[in-house]
């Protein structure tokens, strides 16, 4: 016999052809003998199945000698034998009917699991295989289970449903709530403004919720709150800002904010949590604010960065149009008895400049 | 180590007036925001009044408004409630608590001083 | 002022039964709740801030959960030492408000 599979919710055609390109008289009955639909002269008729308002057949291709039936807004429990009687003749298709379902809410926040579940029919034994739209591949009978999700997990996955060497496909789509970046990090020259970027990486029509920016400053012995506020469709309030820093922050989407000055009492990184209305648990994204300072005092030009800069960073001064360079992995650099010039701070990272900044050394006579 | 230490509790007549005071040690005191808590014998937490780093921004609950005055000075690291025409349902221990805690949240508490207002 | 009813106002529970607590709020309130716990004579202690994040130190038995107007805190399996009153707290608008308290008793 046929096996046909078919996806809970959508439409099936189970064909049943006659030898003859002719209209004839034909049945559909299920595995009870329970007569679903027919014809009777030139009519479609329905018998007292559970299927009757669900179930219809083309007629314009009866003369073509084409019975099929179609039954809509497939059920688990449609999953049968159905049976086509045509010409004295009987015809067996199975369906099998499946169902893919998240668990939850399919706007999910990083980091928490997503778990799909395969409805089915008694008796199949079903193997359901998807792929993420970053091309990952997950197997699974019954249930498949995503730990932690990612950002590059939002969009649409692809999962396959196998039974009797058959497939059905099923797209499901998951958006990850996610800030776009995890950490980013701004090089500042003292006094210079700062801007802090945190982008979401998707879009809600309504977007509800609260947060806050905790920053730890490298210099402090503790954490503390830098500004707190409200999000009310996409339209953001401030609710309490620390008076030192005075931050400023944007009405709307991105989420900005603007710090007046950098200043190495500053420096440090941040943590913005996001709370979204209706779902437990917060978006993160890390910020990194990293300050440099070149000073001279007396007979001594110093070159200063503070913030969470990497071993590996190079902090260099050097004078302008000459050789004269002094270069260290380290958070200060400086040099006794400066000549007289354009000197540059730069901080760098394999060559590529993150940070610059002069000072004048006048003569001293 | 963050310490909030309160005292100037006791029993004042109904209609008096009592000075509690929060002693701060362990922190910046000047970059936080403070709070005063209250619990009446036997009775849930009530919270009674906060103010802001530099003093000039203060919030009261309406049962306490125009009779207590949260005040501090930074200088001193200590927080203050001067309290006036006390009732008997004043009666509480009265806790200095940090809101110095994620999410607006009061991350440390003073043990407490008591106040009873009784005749 | 928002009003913030916790239910159950107590509860008998054994070591190792997990309990929850509800909170709901007279309006929204976001993600600005907290929760407290009290011992008989010591000052409140935080649990939770921002209705679900843990606060350091505080064993991850405790979790927060909820948005908007209804919060639950769940105790995993209660420990001896987690014998006490709990309290909800708002920090959305002005005056903050507590809930009335929930007892946890040994039964």
């Known amino acids: 016999k046929k096996v046909v599979l078919g996806k809970k919710g959508d439409t099936v055609e189970l064909t049943c052809n006659a030898s003859q390109k002719k209209n004839t008289q034909f049945h559909w009955k299920n595995s009870n003998q329970i007569k679903i639909l027919g014809i009777q002269g030139l009519f479609l008729t329905k018998g007292p199945s559970k299927l009757s308002d669900r179930a219809d057949s083309r007629k314009s291709l009866w003369d073509q000698g084409c019975f099929s039936m179609i039954i809509k807004n497939l059920k688990i429990e449609d999953s049968d034998t159905y049976i086509c009687e045509v010409e004295n003749k009987k015809e067996e298709v199975e369906l099998l009917v499946f169902g893919l379902t998240a668990n939850s809410d399919t706007h999910l926040l990083e980091g928490q699991s997503l778990t799909l579940t395969l409805e089915s029919p008694p008796g199949s034994s079903p193997s359901v295989k998807c792929r993420s739209p970053g091309g990952k591949n997950i197997q699974g009978g019954r249930t498949i289970s995503v730990p932690q999700l990612e950002r590059q997990d939002s969009g649409t996955w692809t999962c396959t449903v196998s039974q009797d060497q058959k497939t059905v496909e099923f797209k499901i789509d998951i958006v990850v709530l996610a800030f776009q970046k995890a950490s980013s990090t701004v090089y500042k020259k003292e006094g210079e403004q700062v801007e802090f970027s945190f982008p979401l990486a998707f879009t809600l029509e309504k977007l509800t919720g609260s947060g806050e920016l905790w920053w730890q400053a490298e210099r402090a012995s503790s954490s503390k709150s830098w500004i707190t506020f409200d999000l009310k469709n996409k339209e953001v309030s401030v609710k309490r800002v620390t008076q030192d820093p005075k931050l400023q922050m944007g009405k709307k989407l991105p989420l900005h904010l603007t710090l007046p000055q950098a200043l190495p009492q500053y420096a440090g990184s941040g943590n913005l949590t996001l709370a979204l209305e209706a779902k437990t648990g917060k978006l993160h994204q890390e910020v990194n604010l990293v300050v440099m300072r070149a000073t001279q005092f007396q007979e001594n030009l110093t070159c200063e960065v503070w913030g969470p800069t990497s071993p590996k960073l190079t902090l260099s001064l050097k004078l302008e149009n000459k050789g004269a360079t002094v270069s260290k992995q380290a958070k200060a650099v400086w040099v006794l008895n400066p000549e007289a010039g354009m000197w540059q701070c730069l901080l760098s990272d394999s060559g590529q400049v993150l940070l610059e900044s002069n000072i004048k050394v006048v003569p001293t006579w | 180590e963050v310490q909030l230490v309160e005292s100037g509790g006791g029993l004042v007549q109904p209609g008096g007036s009592l000075r509690l005071s929060c002693a701060a040690s362990g922190f910046t005191f000047s970059s936080y925001w403070m709070s005063w808590v209250r619990q009446a014998p036997g009775k849930g937490l009530e919270w009674v009044a906060n103010i802001n780093e530099d003093g000039n921004e203060k919030y009261y609950v309406d049962s306490v408004k125009g009779r207590l005055t949260i005040s501090r000075d930074n200088a001193k690291n200590s927080l203050y409630l001067q309290m006036n025409s006390l009732r008997a349902e004043d009666t509480a221990v009265y806790f200095c608590?940090?809101?110095?805690?994620?999410?607006?949240?009061?991350?440390?508490w003073g043990q407490g001083a008591l106040v009873t207002v009784s005749s | 002022d928002i009003q913030m009813t916790q239910s159950p106002s107590s509860v008998s529970a054994s070591v190792g039964d997990r309990v929850s607590i509800t909170c709901r709020a007279s309006?929204?309130?976001?993600?600005?709740l907290a929760w407290y716990q009290q011992k008989p004579g010591k000052a409140p202690k935080i649990l939770i801030y921002g209705a679900s994040s843990l606060q350091s130190g505080v064993p991850s038995r405790f979790s927060g959960s909820g948005s908007g107007t209804d919060f639950t805190l769940t105790i995993s399996s209660l420990q001896p030492e987690d014998f006490a009153t709990y309290y909800c707290?708002?920090?959305?608008?002005?005056?903050?408000?507590f809930g009335q308290g929930t007892k946890v008793e040994i039964k």
């Open positions: 309006q929204g309130i976001s993600s600005w």
């Open positions: 608590a940090r809101e110095g805690g994620q999410w607006l949240s009061l991350d440390y």
């Open positions: 707290q708002q920090a959305n608008s002005f005056p903050w408000t």
